[in-house]
């Protein structure tokens, strides 16, 4: 009878993570008597995957009944495959012996490659908000995929971005890989409703890429424009002055009225109106009792927006003159109002 050969018919096997890998192995003879063992890798550091003779291998099942003397099919199934299982697996026939069994013949090996899906891309923006015309960086990360080949694209509101850098780690062979990409985005005043999207395409995703998004509303700060106007006389000796705060984002805003440099009233923006572009408008009124003032009054609307240094706009109210509408005119959009009469 010809000497036993160990046949591993598959040079390579490709399995998706979470699935079961079947590693095929047959012997050409029932002689010599002795166990089959499966190893991952070769040489002294090889890892025992299955021993026909003894041991507990909960993830491994045999394709046929290996307890029988007449069995020549030593194929195994390994369940719940992860990228860490990738490697070359060897089916090795031993000859019965003492004190140890003697390695008799090895198969040529089967390379197990594991296809693992990338994790959902996580997009993160800068830690601090930035204002329009500034360039900000967004990062996108995805992990745990295999094989290494992967495609990453950036979009802003559906338009593909080109200013980005991408790295796939590690550079050499690994059981799984990670991708890290940084994109540069120039902010505009209209970006409150904008989205930045990181799109990852991989062979495991079957043409349905994964997306991670970041809303620019988390990143942008649109500083307000201020306009102070004097309204027609409402009553004898009273003048109504309004401060229109326009096109700001986010909503966090505190307004302070000063009369001749002295704080008259402080309020926080509450009932705001939202513009189509996502920015907000707000209006504050100040009712000034002119008879209480002998000299001209300098009214200042001071706004602290989103923790930034205050910006202000002033209006000179001439007490001697007959009150009439004065002030700077700036194009207004929808205005909200908030009235507090203080005498």
């Amino acid at each position: 009878e010809e000497e036993l050969q160990v046949i591993q018919p598959d040079k390579s096997v490709l399995v998706a993570a979470g699935e079961t890998a079947t590693l095929r192995c047959t012997a050409t003879s029932l002689i010599p008597v002795g166990p089959i063992q499966w190893f991952r890798g070769a040489g002294p550091g090889r890892e025992l995957i299955y021993n026909q003779k003894e041991g507990h291998f909960p993830r491994v099942t045999t394709v046929s009944d290996l307890t029988k003397r007449n069995n020549m099919d030593f194929s195994i199934r390994i369940g719940n495959i992860t990228p860490a299982d990738a490697g070359t697996y060897y089916c090795v026939k031993f000859r019965k012996g003492s004190p140890d069994d003697v390695e008799f013949k090895s198969g040529a090996g089967t390379e197990l490659s594991v296809r693992a899906k990338p994790s959902a891309p996580v997009v993160s923006g800068p830690a601090a908000r930035a204002t329009p015309q500034h360039t900000v960086s967004f990062t996108c990360e995805s992990h745990g995929f295999s094989p290494r080949d992967i495609t990453l694209k950036w979009f802003k509101n559906g338009n593909e971005l080109s200013d980005f850098q991408t790295n796939v780690d590690p550079v050499g062979e690994s059981v799984s890989y990670s991708i890290h990409s940084t994109a540069k985005v120039v902010l505009t005043r209209e970006d409150v409703h904008s989205q930045v999207i990181c799109e990852v395409a991989h062979v495991t995703l079957q043409g349905d890429p994964l997306r991670g998004t970041a809303n620019l509303s988390e990143t942008i700060r649109v500083p307000p424009t201020l306009e102070v106007t004097q309204q027609p006389v409402r009553a004898e000796n009273q003048v109504n002055v309004t401060c229109q705060v326009r096109k700001f984002y986010p909503q966090r805003l505190q307004l302070t009225w000063l009369e001749n440099g002295n704080v008259s009233r402080t309020e926080t923006a509450s009932t705001v109106t939202e513009n189509k572009d996502g920015t907000y408008n707000w209006m504050s009124w100040l009712l000034v009792n002119v008879s209480a003032h002998r000299d001209d009054v300098k009214l200042t609307c001071q706004v602290e927006h989103d923790g930034q240094p205050a910006v202000s706009k002033s209006h000179d109210l001439k007490v001697s003159a007959h009150p009439k509408e004065q002030g700077s005119n700036t194009a207004a959009e929808n205005t909200g109002s908030n009235e507090r009469n203080i005498y």
Epitope: E1, S29, V33, P35, K53, R69, K96, G97, P99
Partner: antibody, heavy 118, light 107 residues
């Protein structure tokens, strides 16, 4: 059903010969090593011979040169040709299948009695 | 040849008892050791192979352990049908050899 049935035992004089048979059924006979084991009355078990799948044979010193094991796969039969029999060969002879992957015996026949006496 | 020595040669026990029979090989036999049960007038029955693997159909009250030269057979809870003679056998190399047997009797 997996079964082994021995036959051919009997009374024989010292120096005589006897041929034992073992009929196998219920399994692929050619794929298993087959053994003979004997047991003298009131004594323990003694392994007598083996014939491997490829026809290779082994014997202990006590029977070597006198006993010959053979197999006929086409007939699912195992044989033990016993020559130059001695009184000490008196025993029940069992055939057994080396059925486990490591050639451990898993199936035994019911035995056939061989008596060597003058 | 490899010598196999069993102890004790005989053993008395009661129903429900747990008993252990030992077998020692004269040299290392790896774990190529089998245990058999034999009742009077009957053929041996295979219980265990490779020291601890249960033959198909054998109840789990039988268990084997050991490697190298020292081996044990344990019967966890004796029943009337378990009273018999037990043999160990090495089958690592020819000639295969048996222990002299342990007769398990009812007390």
């Amino acid at each position: 059903e997996v079964q082994l049935v021995e036959s051919g035992g009997g009374l024989v004089q010292p120096g005589g010969s006897l041929r034992l048979s073992c009929a196998a059924s219920g399994f692929t006979f050619s794929s298993y090593d087959m053994h003979w084991v004997r047991q003298a009355t009131g004594k323990g078990l003694e392994w007598v011979s083996v014939i491997g799948i490829a026809g290779d044979t082994y014997y202990p010193g006590s029977v070597k040169g006198r006993f010959t094991i053979s197999r006929e796969n086409a007939k699912n039969s195992l044989y033990l040709q016993m020559n130059s029999l001695r009184v000490g060969d008196t025993a029940v002879y069992y055939c057994a299948r080396g059925g486990s992957w490591d050639d451990a015996f898993d199936i035994w026949g019911q035995g056939t009695m061989v008596t060597v006496s003058s | 040849d490899i010598q196999m020595t069993q102890s004790p040669s005989s053993l008395s026990a009661s129903i429900g008892d747990k008993v252990t029979i030992t077998c020692r090989a004269s040299q290392d036999i790896n774990n190529y050791l089998a245990w058999f049960q034999q009742k009077p007038g009957k053929a041996p029955k295979s219980l265990i192979y490779t020291a601890s693997s249960l033959q198909s159909g054998v109840p789990s009250k039988f268990s084997g352990s050991g490697s190298g030269t020292d081996f044990t057979l344990t019967i966890s809870s004796l029943q009337p049908e378990d009273f018999a003679t037990y043999y160990c056998q090495q089958y690592v190399s020819y000639p295969y050899t048996f222990g002299q047997g342990t007769k398990l009797e009812i007390k």
